[in-house]
Interface confidence: medium
């Protein structure tokens, strides 16, 4: 379920843009990076696609947003929220957040200046 973010003006169009793109490759790419070749890998249904392929698809998706730079934080927050329940412990949560904040740079975008990834009612 999507969070009610309660913001006004431009950010609502960011929400629409984030909703229109497919964040799954980004989620899978980060999971691949933090899971390595562990057995749990299977449960993420991602072994069929190489991490570099997922990264390229992820960057393509982020690039689809009309205002990629301005809406980047929203996209990162949504990725965090989508994967929150699959992160098994605090260490994994922190790893995921670290990789997530590196994502814009991997895609040759500027990282958002301030982006609070503490989403999902404190679960993550």
């Amino acid at each position: 379920m999507r969070r009610e973010r309660g913001r006004q003006g431009d950010s609502s169009s960011c929400e629409r843009q984030v909703d229109r793109v497919n964040l799954k490759p980004c989620e899978q790419h980060i999971m691949q990076r933090i899971m390595g070749e562990q057995e749990q890998y299977d449960s993420y249904d991602i072994r069929s696609t190489r991490s570099s392929d997922q990264q390229q698809r992820c960057c393509d998706e982020l690039n689809e947003m009309e205002n990629t730079q301005r809406c980047m934080c929203e996209a990162l927050q949504q990725i965090m929220e989508n994967q929150c329940d699959r992160l098994q412990d605090r260490q994994m949560v922190q790893q995921f957040k670290r990789e997530l904040m590196n994502l814009p740079q991997q895609c040759n975008f500027r990282a958002p200046q301030r982006c609070d990834l503490d989403v999902s009612g404190g679960r993550c």
Partner: antibody
Framework: EVQLVESGGGLVRPGGSLRLSCVAS????????MHWVRQAPGKGLLWVSS????????TYADSVKGRFTISRDNTNNTLFLQLDSLRAEDTAVYYC???????????????WGRGTLVTVSS | DIVMTQSPESLAVSLGERATINCKSS??????LGWYQQRPGQPPKLLIY???KRESGVPDRFSGSGSGTDFTLTIGRLQAEDVAVYYC??????????FGGGTKVEIK
């Protein structure tokens, strides 16, 4: 109103040619990838060709490669499909289709014209 | 090219009942799948994209699910206006995108 209107279909003999046109209105044509999809009578859908926003990267289904040419005129909001060396199996309704995507190609299609019928028969 | 296989080819369902259409891809396509409705004499209309996202204006009785190679379109309570042919489409490899063969939904 947001719409696509095709024209140029008709009856043509095998080996003949036709030029299909599609006029777009109600949206900013030059910001969208565009495609042609065809449907033979009573059959399913087959992607034929696509073209990026500035018209520089045409792609084609193997079955039409070398015979069909896609192009666009962004000034007049028009997409074209030149059909040459036509065969009986090219008989179909040809739909002009807008891609939802802006940057990458051939994703899903959120706006369809009503189609124009091409009949290839001797 | 990735082959999309739909089942069943046709389906007769009573008004108000649930209709379920399946689509299987010949290889993994993650969630790069759309569903279209084509009513008689009309062009196709986008219903679902990214396997499960409903297009704006599409009634919520239509829902999509699945990932990888197996996908489902469900019409929760069939209405008379839902009589149509439904197509799935993969866009994981593009071009070419490929469509399933279609499933005809009729009233029982």
């Amino acid at each position: 109103e947001v719409q696509l209107v095709e024209s140029g279909g008709g009856l043509v003999r095998p080996g003949g040619s036709l030029r299909l046109s599609c006029v777009a209105s109600g949206f900013t044509f030059n910001t969208y990838w565009m495609h042609w999809v065809r449907q033979a009578p009573g059959k399913g859908l087959l992607w034929v060709s696509s073209l990026n926003k500035d018209g520089s990267s045409p792609t084609y289904a193997d079955s039409v490669k070398g015979r069909f040419t896609i192009s666009r005129d962004n000034t007049n909001n028009t997409l074209f499909l030149q059909l040459d060396s036509l065969r009986a199996e090219d008989t179909a309704v040809y739909y002009c289709v807008r891609d939802r995507r802006a940057v990458t190609t051939a994703r899903y299609f959120d706006l369809w014209g009503r189609g124009t019928l091409v009949t290839v028969s001797s | 090219d990735i082959v999309m296989t739909q089942s069943p080819e046709s389906l007769a369902v009573s008004l108000g009942e649930r209709a379920t259409i399946n689509c299987k891809s010949s290889s993994n396509i993650d969630n790069y799948l759309g569903w279209y409705q084509q009513r008689p004499g009309q062009p196709p209309k986008l219903l679902i994209y990214w396997a499960s996202k409903r297009e704006s204006g599409v009634p919520d009785r239509f829902s999509g699910s699945g990932s990888g190679t197996d996908f489902t379109l469900t019409i929760g309570r069939l209405q008379a206006e839902d009589v149509a042919v439904y197509y799935c489409q993969q866009y994981y490899t593009s071009p070419p995108v490929t469509f399933g063969g279609g499933t005809k939904v009729e009233i029982k």
